[in-house]
């Protein structure tokens, strides 16, 4: 949580961003809050990235002004405007790409001052994984995949009987480059695995930690999954 | 409401310059929510989207056309139009204008009823 | 450019019939998906935009649904006026392009 007072001859106000993690080809969001004003037509929004010459975003007079906007966000950008009178600032970006990563700082004026926190905005792809059991192999194995993953993760074995054991040489992980040639889809297979268990498959780089689940008995089958970005911090 | 109203000559020569301009009325182009753009449709055909202009000025062309395609903006007429150079046959279409939904939604609404250009000698 | 493909192409019911018409992307477009109505001589109509959200003053007999890279256009049950070529269009990223039309016609 990045909490920014403002330092003019104004009163200042308290902006608050948090930090997040954006999935490429999706849509994100990025989290900015403010003290409210009672009139509309007083708040202007603007969002700026270091390194960027021109705004990301901006809103004034109760309507976006995108005249300065820089080309790389070109019709990417809306703030969620029936929100701003209530103090939301935060930023809808659309088709986030790898290169929309980096510090960005969100800058707001009202009646009553100005002020602006930073964000740090990570991007990259993360996805769910499904562990299956794998009948076509000689063995009892188990599959794992996720389709989008960047940049390459580390993938981890665990089982609840044997807590602690390492999988490493009964697995295998092969990561496969995907169409758009960014993103890879993970594919990990686990050997010998034994019955009236829990395998847990977790898949993690810097944004994001997934972990799927299967326990096999003699008479079904479970699956759980999960996935938790690793860097929401507020400022 | 927004209404969108295309003008222009219904027919231009192969090599020459179609000029299309589209007036804006029940609202103000200036309005800083909303991308502009021109659309055509070729002769039983699909749509082909030609590029946007917001009311700054700041364009973005299809690739496809980008070496022939030049929009521009009048405020004070609340209008914006379209030029497309060196144009054969194959420009023949229907020429739409119309507006998008929002700065990060670009679905269509409203549209102009569209213009027929016929390119002949 | 993202291609879009739209599928069938030209599809024959009758009044009061439930009509599924199809389009995919070439690349995942998250929800930007857009439908429009267009009938002869007249400009395309906006029904769906965002993938499912319905377009005000159109009729709730139209519904989409779809994310990603597959996206269905429904009309519950066909009405007379609903006689006419359907169209979608992506605005995920630019260029932005459409499909190619489904013209629904009278069986």
């Known amino acids: 949580l990045i909490i920014g007072f403002g330092i003019s001859g104004r009163h200042s106000i308290t902006v608050t961003t948090v930090a997040s993690a954006g999935n490429i080809g999706e849509d994100g969001i990025l989290s900015c809050t403010f003290e409210p004003d009672i009139k509309l037509s007083d708040i202007v929004i603007q969002w700026l990235k270091e390194g960027v010459l021109g705004l990301v975003h901006e809103f004034k007079e109760g309507k976006d002004e995108l005249s300065e906007q820089d080309e790389m966000f070109r019709g990417r950008t809306a703030v969620f405007a029936d929100q701003v009178i209530v103090g939301n600032a935060s930023l809808r970006l659309k088709n986030v790409q790898l290169t929309d990563a980096g510090t960005y700082k969100c800058y707001i004026i009202t009646s009553k001052g100005k002020g602006n926190a930073n964000l740090e905005y990570k991007t990259g792809a993360f996805s769910m994984p499904e562990v299956n059991v794998d009948y076509n192999a000689s063995s009892e194995t188990l599959r794992c995949e996720a389709p989008r993953w960047f940049p390459q993760p580390t993938v981890v074995w665990a089982s609840q009987v044997d807590q602690g054991a390492n999988f490493s040489e009964v697995s295998n992980t092969s990561f496969e480059l995907n169409s758009e040639n960014v993103t890879m889809k993970v594919v990990s297979v686990l050997y010998n695995v034994t019955i009236n268990n829990t395998y847990s498959c977790m898949i993690e780089n810097d944004i994001a930690k997934a972990t799927g689940d299967i326990k096999v008995t003699e008479s079904e089958i479970k699956r759980r999954s999960h996935l938790q970005l690793l860097n929401s911090k507020a400022s | 409401q927004v209404q969108l109203q295309e003008s222009g000559p219904g027919l231009v020569k192969p090599s020459q310059t179609l000029s299309l301009t589209c007036t804006v009325s029940g609202g103000s182009i200036s309005d800083g929510s909303y991308y502009w753009s021109w659309i055509r449709q070729h002769p039983g055909k699909g749509l082909e989207w030609i590029g946007n202009i917001y009311y700054s000025g700041s364009t973005y062309y299809n690739p496809s056309l980008r070496s022939r395609v030049t929009m521009s903006v009048d405020t004070s007429k609340n209008q914006f139009s379209l030029k497309l150079s060196s144009v054969t046959a194959a420009d023949t279409a229907v020429y739409y204008c119309?507006?998008?939904?929002?700065?990060?939604?670009?679905?269509?609404?409203?549209w102009g009823q569209g213009t027929l250009v016929t390119v002949s000698s | 450019d993202i291609q879009m493909t739209q599928s069938p192409s030209t599809l024959s019911a009758s009044v009061g019939d439930r009509v599924t018409i199809t389009c995919r992307a070439s690349?995942?477009?998250?929800?930007?998906l857009a439908w429009y109505q267009q009938k002869p001589g007249k400009a395309p109509k906006l029904l769906i935009y965002e993938a499912s959200s319905l377009h005000s003053g159109v009729p709730s007999r139209f519904s989409g649904s779809g994310s990603g890279t597959e996206f269905t256009l429904t009309i519950s049950s066909l009405q007379p006026d609903d006689f006419a070529t359907y169209y979608c269009q992506q605005d995920n990223s630019y260029p932005y392009t459409f499909g190619g039309g489904t013209k629904v016609e009278i069986k």
């Open positions: 119309a507006r998008g939904l929002s700065t990060i939604d670009e679905a269509f609404d409203p």
């Open positions: 690349k995942s477009i998250s929800s930007w």
